[in-house]
């Protein structure tokens, strides 16, 4: 659904928001999956989205930084394999991820991202359609 | 359909600033987010940045940073982009465009800015 | 910043022709990129999304190919309402466009 692919593609410009300002955020380390096995994608997106990201204080960048993540975490509407998803046992705990600092942490999390829009892409049929 | 109009040409002298205005209609202002690109004369496109019409978020091209401010009015479905400090460099056809899955979908029909003292 | 480069800067061609434009991104992209069409005095029309895929209502002759720096776009056969500029765009990072391809009458 176009709307799904749209918020995957608005996380993406938000992380890459935050990849500019990576030296203001607060450098804890945090889960950041990667190599997600097959149908636990949504699982590890909320992993990313429950993850405690934030800023270091550093004055100026506070505000756009703060704001980026709070937009980062607001859930969207979910679809039927996220439902599904959330409450599969198989899928690994947020905490069995490995821990990586923010800059590692917000590649990581683009990366899904973009798996998961190729992935959608390639269960649409290649014809004329809308982007 | 989706329709995209935008305020008419401007001129103006540097130092000043000015504010663009581009109206919706015919989809869901909030469902989605917009962008702004210019054109400058007989030049390429220029992303410039873009804001989500549903709150204030914005992200902006580094290029403009503290020149750029992007803000919308819900109650009209009306995006606006203002440019400050204005300069010689900055005459271009300014564009808003909405924000698709994918691409920008749908663009404005313009708006000529002209910098002149 | 990722800059894209495109070539050739401009072509002359006639009706019928192939034609075939290209694009470089200075890193890897996947296939984040987009093709627009450009007519003087008019605003840019979206052609092909994510390097391949066909806008609606843009005809088969166009194509698009490509993957991670280097990408195409070819028109099979070139039609009178097809002169104009081409642009290609990334959106792997934010977004950044092509300087531009114009085609024209030979």
């Known amino acids: 659904q176009d709307r799904h692919m749209i918020r995957m593609r608005q996380l993406i410009d938000i992380v890459d928001q935050l990849k500019n300002y990576v030296n203001d955020l607060d450098p804890e380390f945090l889960p950041a999956p990667e190599d997600v096995e097959t149908n636990c994608e949504w699982s590890a997106i909320s992993c990313f989205q429950k993850a405690q990201l934030k800023s270091a204080n550093t004055g100026n960048n506070e505000r756009i930084i703060n704001l980026s993540i709070k937009k980062l975490k607001r859930k969207s509407p979910s679809t039927g394999a996220e439902r599904r998803q959330k409450h599969r046992l198989t899928c690994p705990s947020c905490d069995s991820y490995e821990k990586k600092p923010p800059k590692e942490f917000l590649e990581r999390f683009k990366s899904l991202l973009q798996k998961m829009i190729h992935q959608h892409l390639s269960s649409r049929t290649h014809g004329s359609e809308d982007s | 359909q989706v329709q995209l109009v935008q305020s008419g040409a401007e001129v103006k002298k540097p130092g000043a600033s000015v504010k663009v205005s581009c109206k919706a209609s015919?989809?869901?202002?909030?469902?989605?987010?917009m962008h702004w690109v210019r054109q400058a004369p007989g030049q390429g496109l220029e992303w410039m940045g873009l804001?989500?019409?549903?709150?204030?978020?914005?992200i902006y091209n580094q290029k403009f940073k503290g020149r750029v401010t992007m803000t919308r009015d819900t109650s009209t479905s009306t995006v606006y982009m203002e440019l400050s400090s204005l300069r010689s460099e900055d005459t271009a056809v300014y564009y808003c465009?909405?924000?698709?899955?994918?691409?920008?979908?749908?663009w404005g029909q313009g708006t000529l800015v002209t910098v002149s003292s | 910043d990722i800059q894209m480069t495109q070539s050739p800067s401009s072509l002359s061609a006639s009706v019928g022709d192939r034609v075939t434009i290209t694009c470089r991104a200075s890193?890897?992209?996947?296939?984040?990129l987009n093709w627009y069409q450009q007519k003087p005095g008019k605003a840019p029309k979206l052609l092909i999304y994510?390097?391949?895929r066909l806008h609606s209502g843009v005809p088969s002759r166009f194509s698009g190919s490509g993957s991670g720096t280097d990408f195409t776009l070819t028109i099979s056969s070139l039609q009178p309402e097809d002169f104009a500029t081409y642009y290609c765009?990334?959106?792997?990072?934010?977004?950044?466009f092509g300087g531009g391809t114009k085609v024209e009458i030979k």
């Open positions: 994510y390097t391949s």
């Open positions: 015919g989809y869901t202002f909030t469902d989605y987010w």
């Open positions: 765009q990334q959106f792997h990072t934010l977004r950044t």
């Open positions: 890193q890897d992209i996947s296939n984040y």
């Open positions: 465009a909405r924000y698709g899955p994918l691409a920008m979908d749908y």
């Open positions: 804001i989500d019409t549903s709150d204030v978020y914005t």
